[in-house]
Interface confidence: medium
Amino acid sequence: EVEKTACPSGKKAREIDESLIFYKKWELEACVDAALLATQMDRVNAIPFTYEQLDVLKHKLDELYPQGYPESVIQHLGYLFLKMSPEDIRKWNVTSLETLKALLEVNKGHEMSPQVATLIDRFVKGRGQLDKDTLDTLTAFYPGYLCSLSPEELSSVPPSSIWAVRPQDLDTCDPRQLDVLYPKARLAFQNMNGSEYFVKIQSFLGGAPTEDLKALSQQNVSMDLATFMKLRTDAVLPLTVAEVQKLLGPHVEGLKAEERHRPVRDWILRQRQDDLDTLGLGLQGGIPNGYLVLDLSMQEALS
């Protein structure tokens, strides 16, 4: 809290300019009118105010707007945004994407702070859904943003927004998140032709069910091993050796290097050794010839 002291003669600020960097904190408090600051916020970012001086400027705005800043001020906060607490931000009503971009720009190159997380949350809730332009903006600043959302939050993403998602945006998503995103992606890309469709859907396939993988195996897609290794184990297990061979195409040889890792390991255990041998890769661990395979899940369903 800065003491209330009279402004020294001749020091009253008539505009927000570089001369203010030479003011001590108490002088800023006494000599800068809050209403003037609010109307000239766009200038603050161009002036090298220190961290400490920004505290004073924030204090002045807090006094002027105890119920929360108007968007006209928020949009021009610049570095002053760094001084805001999540509690401050919860009082705001941010509706403009330009405002969001301006504030994310201030934090660019830094990890997502609690302030930024609160800002995004307020913005998205205000819009009612994560539309394409918002998602585009957020993933541009924070490629991991999508994967930071819960499956429940992801359910509000409209399929049309999926076009804004890049493969790297999904790098840290877990299977539960991909389970939600995959059907949206399937819907978004449904009118594309085979090869183009596969390029777009590839990064979402960690949420694909068995029947979709079987369908893809009929389309000469040549899935790479990195994508295959991210597939749901329960979706891969029912695939036949022939289907996996078609799905991977020339990449099938990579199975040997991954035979001890999921889902390849578990898939091998479910295949007849005879069938695995047809690949000529030396994969071991399949069901020996002459053994009867009982599908227990089917048995349970019938009983």
Epitope: P48, F49, T50, Y51, L54
Partner: nanobody
Framework: EVQLVESGGGLVQAGGSLRLSCAAS????????MGWYRQAPGKQRELVAA???????NYADSVKGRFTISRDNAKNTVYLQMNSLKPEDTAVYYC???????????WGQGTQVTVSS
């Protein structure tokens, strides 16, 4: 975190000159605005000159026309050329970042400038 070491101070006659240097460690130095500050005995520390990352400068009225701030980003160094020194310039001089991102509460030792009449 940027570490700052000031040097170049000394005893000088009124009207004389000194050149202060501030060596900074830290890869982000070139992106920070920097400032030279001074603190005379019994007085508050005050900013005397500032320089942006791009090199634009600003001076307190009391030193305008006499002091020049400059920077060499390749050497991670900020300078303060002080000409026509006056006894009232006597103080400990410090440099520090003026980045809005960095709380500038970690000050170096400073360098003493004494101007005798």
């Amino acid at each position: 975190e940027v570490q700052l070491v000031e040097s170049g101070g000394g005893l000088v006659q009124a009207g004389g000159s000194l050149r202060l240097s501030c060596a900074a460690s830290g890869s982000t130095f070139s992106s920070y605005p920097m400032g030279w500050y001074r603190q005379a005995p019994g007085k508050q520390r005050e900013l005397v000159a500032a320089i942006s990352s791009g090199g634009s400068t600003n001076y307190a009225d009391s030193v305008k026309g006499r002091f020049t701030i400059s920077r060499d980003n390749a050497k991670n160094t900020v300078y303060l050329q002080m000409n026509s020194l006056k006894p009232e310039d006597t103080a400990v001089y410090y440099c520090n970042t003026r980045s809005p991102r960095v709380p500038n509460d970690s000050w170096g030792q400073g360098t003493q400038v004494t101007v005798s009449s």
